[in-house]
């Protein structure tokens, strides 16, 4: 059978039929259904939702839908011994206590099992001491404190504002600075957009709202007790002392009403500059400790959360491919939420549900995709990407041989301004071509393509007339597929206007106020942005699973490799004396990139010309495309981060959410002027250039003619 016969309808009609079947009203209905009660990982409610999704995906027409369970380390507050922070006087009396819960939103007053705000995986402890305000607790904030201001955080409790970087990096930095506790808070400067009311009257964070979240530094390990292997029934588990990525000091999050009470008394040093000031009516003094009248008062944390091995459930649905059933295109997003999950994750899960329904409708009409599509509803993403990582660890041999692409589907919206895409360069052309075929949902762009509105609102900084596409970082379920296994990956959602809204994420992120009503009233009443995201995510999956030649363009990798080589060379040249002294050469890297560019160009020419009716040659060329991303994987991983194995991209060592290019070289160069042994440090830079150059050259050779 030719591929078109096997799929039963002409490819163009298929895509149109698939997209036309997606309905905003269905997404709205699914979102409502998924957000009426909390679905915290490891709870009965989330297990019931997993079974409901399994049942509905079967009804929609998937070939099989299975639950995959694992027993992983999770973290919960103690129900009878709540977590809180106090100001204590010299007699040890608690003269102020932070709130024990968020005031529930209207209509949810009687909902049970709302987990109070906590920092997941915080150890237990009751440290007391002076407070130091550390801004965002970024690497550069601690450099400013320790090196410029000569402020020592050792033995202090630090208070940091949420935003800019992943909270786990903040905690790691505080630990390294010697802090004995961390208080995280949401400053209105970052979580309250001017001119917008707070929930329930708008989408801003009220003073009692608090961001939950895990504070792990897993570096891609998955379950902290079973790194590298699935947490199955016969797993060998590490002791808690050997667990991966757990914080060593107590951590707790608060809202800005409570933060005001702590920060208003701060004394010590003034803030170093305006970038350390938020929007509260407090001096933003750094400390340490409280000012004059309050100098005998201290801060005390009371943390009683427990870490527990708990069962989690992924839902895995399969739509078998007609021509290449052993080639997998995966669409996955998580199901577990901190509370109601109005945006994170259920705005994504509702979109996945509608995509499954549309594919199922086509299948019932006799159609099948060329390649197998796997659909996943991941559990325990909020606790460290655990469900996706354990499943990938269990199925790694299949995935590394058969995985074509992974499309992530967490929150569909974080705003309603324009599209945001992060993906492998292999998918740039796919995304461009697809968005040119889709209608823009944006006001003022009626009758225009999504590509046009996206390019206008979010232009590429390098290429005029093209939209910005960002590097993949981490903090979501694509991590194991891309950073560990080297499977081409991408993600898409609707976002805010980053130019005018400087706040981090969206204001109600991980709070009790992330409800269905938040989305329906304030973000997307017509669900038109959700529908557009469904079309982008679904359209990508459709093309990846159905196009005869994989829609990957290796020439786009060549372009970015050159850009990244230029960038890392420029960073290194900021140390010209050492470059000369230690004979640090980038020649091998530039040469490898040049070779990659030439070989990719020749491969693309062959791709245009080969006989697509020859199934062996077609499969050969497609395999070269599929395995190109895999070729960037170093089996030894990055230094001290064995599960980050991609040589071109890794999550930044300073912010898990951000992607870094040539991360091995970047980390070797970072703060190199402070290294005690410069010869050793520059030796590591040279080694990392060697690894990068070798990897790029080796990847290029996978695109050469096979014989």
């Amino acid at each position: 059978k030719s591929s078109n016969e096997a799929t039963n309808i002409t490819p163009k009609h298929n895509m149109k039929a698939f997209l036309d079947e997606l309905k905003a009203e269905n997404i709205k209905k699914f979102l409502y259904n998924f957000t009426q009660i909390p679905h915290l990982a490891g709870t009965e409610q989330n297990f019931q939702l997993a079974k409901q999704i399994q049942s509905q995906w079967k009804e929609f027409g998937l070939d099989s839908v299975e639950l995959a369970h694992y027993d992983v380390l999770l973290s919960y507050p103690n129900k009878t011994h709540p977590n809180y922070i106090s100001i204590i006087n010299e007699d040890g009396n608690e003269i102020f206590n932070t709130s024990l819960f968020e005031p529930p939103p209207p209509g949810y007053e009687n909902v049970s099992d709302i987990v109070p705000p906590f920092s997941a995986f915080s150890p237990q402890g009751m440290p007391e001491g002076d407070l130091v305000y550390v801004n965002y607790a970024r690497t550069e904030d601690f450099f400013k404190l320790e090196r410029d201001m000569k402020i020592n955080c050792s033995g202090k409790i630090v208070i940091a504002r949420y935003g800019k970087v992943f909270r786990g990096n903040k905690v790691k930095n505080a630990q390294l600075a010697g802090a004995k506790g961390v208080i995280l808070y949401s400053d209105p400067a970052d979580y309250f957009a001017p001119g917008v009311k707070s929930y329930p009257d708008g989408w801003n964070l009220p003073g009692g709202g608090v961001q939950r979240g895990n504070i792990l530094n897993l570096n891609g390990a998955g379950d902290p007790l079973t790194p590298g292997y699935p947490a199955n029934e016969y797993a060998y588990r590490r002791g808690i002392a050997e667990a991966v990525g757990l914080p060593s000091i107590p951590v707790h999050p608060i809202g800005y009403y409570d933060a005001q009470k702590l920060l208003e008394k701060m004394g010590g040093s003034a803030p170093p500059d305006s970038s350390w000031r938020g929007s509260l009516k407090v001096p933003y003094n750094v400390g340490p400790g409280f000012t004059g009248n309050f100098s005998t008062q201290k801060v005390k944390m009371h943390i009683h959360s427990t870490n527990e091995v708990t069962r989690i459930y992924n839902v895995i649905g399969t739509l078998r491919g007609a021509v290449e059933p052993d080639r997998y295109v995966i669409l996955g997003g998580h199901r577990d939420s901190w509370v109601f999950g109005g945006i994170d994750p259920q705005s994504g899960a509702a979109v996945v549900h509608e995509i499954v329904r549309s594919f199922g409708t086509l299948k019932k009409e006799g159609w099948r995709p060329r390649r197998t599509i796997l659909f996943a509803s991941w559990d325990a993403e909020e606790f460290g990407l655990l469900g996706s990582t354990e499943w990938a660890e269990e199925n790694s041999r299949l995935l590394q041989e058969r995985g074509v692409a992974y499309i992530n589907a967490d929150s569909s919206i974080e705003g309603n301004y324009t599209l945001r895409v992060d993906c492998t360069p292999l998918m740039y052309s796919l995304v461009h071509n697809l968005t040119k075929e889709l209608k823009s949902p944006d006001e003022g762009f009626e009758g225009k393509s999504l590509y046009e509105s996206w390019t206008k609102k979010s232009p590429s900084p390098e290429f005029s007339g093209m939209p910005r596409i960002s590097k993949l970082g981490s903090g979501n379920d694509f991590e194991v597929f891309f950073q560990r296994l080297g499977i081409a990956s991408g993600r898409a959602r609707y976002t805010k206007n980053w130019e005018t809204n400087k706040f981090s994420g969206y204001p109600l992120y991980h709070s009790v106020y992330e409800t269905y009503e938040l989305v329906e009233k304030f973000y997307d009443p017509m669900f038109k942005y959700h529908l557009t995201v469904a079309q982008v995510r679904g359209g990508m999956v459709f093309e990846l699973a159905n196009s005869i030649v994989l829609p990957f363009d290796c020439r786009d990798y060549a372009v970015v490799l050159r850009k990244y080589a230029d960038k890392i060379y420029s960073i290194s040249m900021k140390h010209p004396q050492e470059m000369k002294t230690y004979s640090v050469s980038f020649d091998s890297l530039f040469s490898a990139v040049k070779n990659f560019t030439e070989i990719a160009s020749k491969f693309s020419e062959r791709l245009q010309d080969f006989d697509k009716s020859n199934p062996i040659v077609l499969r050969m060329m497609n395999d070269q495309l599929m395995f190109l991303e895999r070729a960037f994987i170093d089996p030894l991983g990055l230094p001290d981060r064995p599960f980050y194995r991609h040589v071109i991209y890794a999550p930044s060592s300073h912010n898990k959410y951000a992607g870094e290019s040539f991360p091995g070289i970047y980390d070797a160069l970072f703060d190199i002027e402070s290294k005690v042994d410069p010869s050793k440090a520059w030796g590591e830079v040279k080694r990392q250039i060697y690894v990068a150059a070798f990897t790029v050259q080796a990847a290029a050779e996978t695109l050469s003619e096979v014989a």
């Epitope: 390098e462 050159r562 850009k563 080589a565 230029d566 960038k567 060379y569 420029s570 290194s572 040249m573 010209p576 470059m579 000369k580 004979s583 640090v584 050469s585 980038f586 020649d587 530039f590 040469s591 990139v593 040049k594």
Partner: nanobody, 113 residues
């Protein structure tokens, strides 16, 4: 054999301008990022600016930003540094650098009244 030949240095008054050139040969010019590095009398080497494969990808040291402009002409295998609003402290030997290990012999820029 890689060769980098700087020219365009000289004596100039404060506030004046100079344009340095670096003629390159012996390698595929357009395939490499390039840099300007300087060394003031009695001081260590100091990075000035770098450029990627085209004139969009540029990077400057804080002390020259807004005054100096790096550019390249791949058809002529030549790297440039346009230096405006020169200051006495810009006095140095300016080197053209390819890949970190291949350096030109340098051209002296003297800024003096």
């Amino acid at each position: 054999e890689v060769q980098l030949l700087e020219s365009g240095g000289g004596l100039v008054q404060p506030g004046g301008s100079l344009r340095l050139s670096c003629a390159a040969s012996g390698f595929s010019f357009s395939s490499y990022a390039l840099s300007w590095v300087r060394q003031a009398p009695g001081k260590g080497l100091e990075w000035v600016s770098s450029i990627g494969e085209n004139n969009h990808t540029t990077d400057y040291a804080a002390f020259v930003k807004g005054r100096f402009t790096i550019s390249r002409d791949n058809s002529k295998n030549t790297l440039y540094l346009q230096m405006n609003s020169l200051r006495v402290e810009d006095t140095a030997v300016y080197y053209c650098v390819k890949d970190g290990v291949h350096w030109g012999q340098g051209t002296l820029v003297t800024v003096s009244s």
